[in-house]
Interface confidence: medium
Amino acid sequence: TKTESSSRGPYHPSECCFTYTTYKIPRQRIMDYYETNSQCSKPGIVFITKRGHSVCTNPSDKWVQDYIKDMKEN
């Protein structure tokens, strides 16, 4: 199968995040996360969904911080 990116969301970042999602991703969809490289022009947290999609998010958003905290604790 193929997984396509969409103009409606910042999917499949290569190394850096240039845009952030404007949607709060449902927590139950998220499998993992990683921080983008510190040399990127913008900071980013990339959430990986249970279907393998990667989504750029803003590390300043409270929901992003809450999700990271939750995943670290669990």
Partner: antibody
Framework: QEQLKESGGGLVQPGGSLKLSCKAS????????MSWVRQAPGKGLEWIGY????????AYASWVNGRFTISSHNAQNTLYLHLNSLTAADTATYFC????????????????WGQGTLVTVSS | AIVMTQTPASVEAAVGGTVTIKCQAS??????LAWYQQKPGQPPRLLIY???TLASGVPSRFKGSGSGTQFTLTISDLECADAATYYC???????????????FGGGTEVVVK
């Protein structure tokens, strides 16, 4: 009551196109993935693809080869399947299904199905 | 792509009896397997997900087990209403290729005498 209802099926000529709809009611449409699954007469189930209604991201079975496109209109709680370059082999009942994530791992399962809409490709 | 092989294709049993359906995955899928029941002219109905968790409203006569590549659906105390075709299904995601796919087994017809 949670419900899915497909429409748009019918008789179409080989090489033709069709747009199927699936209206959701009774649940938050964008909270889960939505899939299309088909079943040829007397045959088994065959997954076509899914959409993430939040982002519009899609994934398809390899055999689809770009002939089918899944989209959604979240405000109308409606899922669509655009069928192109149809052949007799595409004759089937097409089901939409809510595609629920597993709590702890990759992928999901189909916990709500529509009744299906029959597409017949014949000249 | 992952392949789900279901056996047998058809099975016959008496009311009150027990039926066992097997589903084999071509590679490990952990416990990410679901079972569905489909009667003629109806859509499939979810019975079991995560290999062994009973879906809402499904009687405990239906039991799912297994993990990795080998899975089993057991229907005990068979009723006439259990006559249907049963399918297994998984979603397989490959981290290496970053693609996912749903796969169904070929189905098993259960005939209740």
């Amino acid at each position: 009551q949670e419900q899915l209802k497909e429409s748009g099926g019918g008789l179409v000529q080989p090489g033709g196109s069709l747009k199927l709809s699936c209206k959701a009611s009774g649940f938050a449409f964008s909270s889960d993935y939505m899939s299309w699954v088909r079943q040829a007469p007397g045959k088994g189930l065959e997954w076509i693809g899914y959409i993430d209604p939040i982002f519009g991201s899609t994934a398809y079975a390899s055999w689809v080869n770009g002939r089918f496109t899944i989209s959604s209109h979240n405000a109308q709680n409606t899922l669509y399947l655009h069928l192109n370059s149809l052949t007799a082999a595409d004759t089937a009942t097409y089901f939409c299904a809510r595609d629920k994530d597993y709590s702890s791992g990759w992928g999901g399962y189909f916990n709500l199905w529509g009744q299906g809409t029959l597409v017949t490709v014949s000249s | 792509a992952i392949v789900m092989t279901q056996t047998p294709a058809s099975v016959e049993a008496a009311v009150g009896g027990t039926v066992t359906i097997k589903c084999q995955a071509s590679q490990s899928i952990n416990s990410y397997l679901a079972w569905y029941q489909q009667k003629p002219g109806q859509p499939p109905r979810l019975l079991i997900y995560e290999a062994s968790t009973l879906a809402s409203g499904v009687p405990s006569r239906f039991k799912g087990s297994g993990s990795g590549t080998q899975f089993t659906l057991t229907i005990s105390d068979l009723e006439c209403a259990d006559a249907a075709t049963y399918y297994c299904q998984t979603y397989y995601y490959s981290v290496d290729s970053s693609v996912g796919s749903n796969a169904f087994g070929g189905g098993t017809e259960v005939v209740v005498k």
